[in-house]
């Protein structure tokens, strides 16, 4: 014998009170699939998460967070704080990068800057909290005396008319 | 497949005590810091407590320090937070969290593992 359930559809649970008949699920309640026997409650999005996509008889609520915060975790579980750039959040909160790391982003950690010399190159821009040394030429290329070389004129793409 | 189960949430008054164990699966508990971390329903992640894989080295946010205490059973693959003098400020859902490595501190954290959350509300 088939399950009488099995005929409610999303959005209605199979009603025991009323002789298995099927019900629409409640205000602030859903079902996302057929044959449910109770209807979920509805997530509700308050304080320092916000509503991204309402609930409907079928589907939950999904939240995210409020400006200055991110989401973590499944579905957007947590909001962690936002740092500004230069900074990367610890336990205790944001904190400044140390001097010789940088972090360009809002979240994430400090990162060292790039040890040019590791390329055989020099430092052309030195570093910040906020941005990563830019490296340049090797210092070799700079000594008197050093051949200068044209680069090759970069290649264009097939169909575009120089400037 | 790694897992953290929280449990132990619930509505209590203040001035009570709750206790919150995690069940950890699927990695070699004692290997590994792990963390305690509160939402609060206003605003962000706050970090509550850290213990290290041995369970020797522990940390406590300054607002919980004093009332809160950590410590894991690494026979039972159990993180504890004992929750003692709770404030209507600690109403919040309380995450356990694998950190990456074997020691912690109070300062930077490396969450590779969530839990899903156990709430605790406190209220008269």
């Known amino acids: 014998l088939q399950d009488p359930c099995s005929n409610c559809p999303a959005g209605t649970f199979c009603d025991n009170n009323r002789n298995q008949i099927c019900s629409p699920c409640p205000p602030n309640s859903f079902s996302s699939a057929g044959g449910q026997r109770t209807c979920d409650i509805c997530r509700q999005c308050k304080g320092v998460f916000r509503t991204r996509k309402e609930c409907s008889s079928t589907s939950n609520a999904e939240c995210d967070c409020t400006p200055g915060f991110h989401c973590l975790g499944a579905g957007c579980s947590m909001c962690e704080q936002d740092c500004k750039q230069g900074q990367e959040l610890t336990k205790k909160g944001c904190k400044d990068c140390c001097f010789g790391t940088f972090n360009d982003q809002k979240r994430g950690i400090c990162r060292p800057w790039t040890n040019c010399s590791l390329d055989g190159k020099s430092v052309l821009v030195n570093g910040t909290k906020e941005r990563d040394v830019v490296c340049g030429p090797s210092p070799a290329d700079l000594s008197p005396g050093a051949s200068s070389v044209t680069p090759p004129a970069p290649a264009r793409e097939p169909g575009h008319s120089p400037q | 497949e790694v897992q953290l189960l929280e449990s132990g949430g619930g509505l209590v008054q203040p001035g009570g005590s709750l206790r919150l164990s995690c069940a950890a699966s699927?990695?070699?508990?004692?290997?590994?810091?792990m963390s305690w971390f509160r939402q609060p329903p206003e605003t962000g992640l706050q970090w509550v407590s850290s213990i290290g894989g041995s369970g020797g080295d522990t940390y406590y946010a300054d607002s919980v320090k004093g009332r809160f205490t950590i410590s894991r059973d690494n026979s039972k693959n159990t993180l504890y937070l004992q929750m003692n003098s709770l404030r209507a400020e600690d109403t919040a859902v309380y995450y356990c969290?694998?950190?990456?490595?074997?020691?912690?501190?109070?300062?930077?954290?490396?969450?590779?593992?969530w839990g899903q959350g156990t709430t605790v509300t406190v209220s008269s």
């Open positions: 699927g990695f070699t508990f004692s290997s590994y810091a």
């Open positions: 969290a694998k950190e990456g490595s074997n020691g912690t501190d109070d300062n930077y954290y490396d969450v590779d593992v």
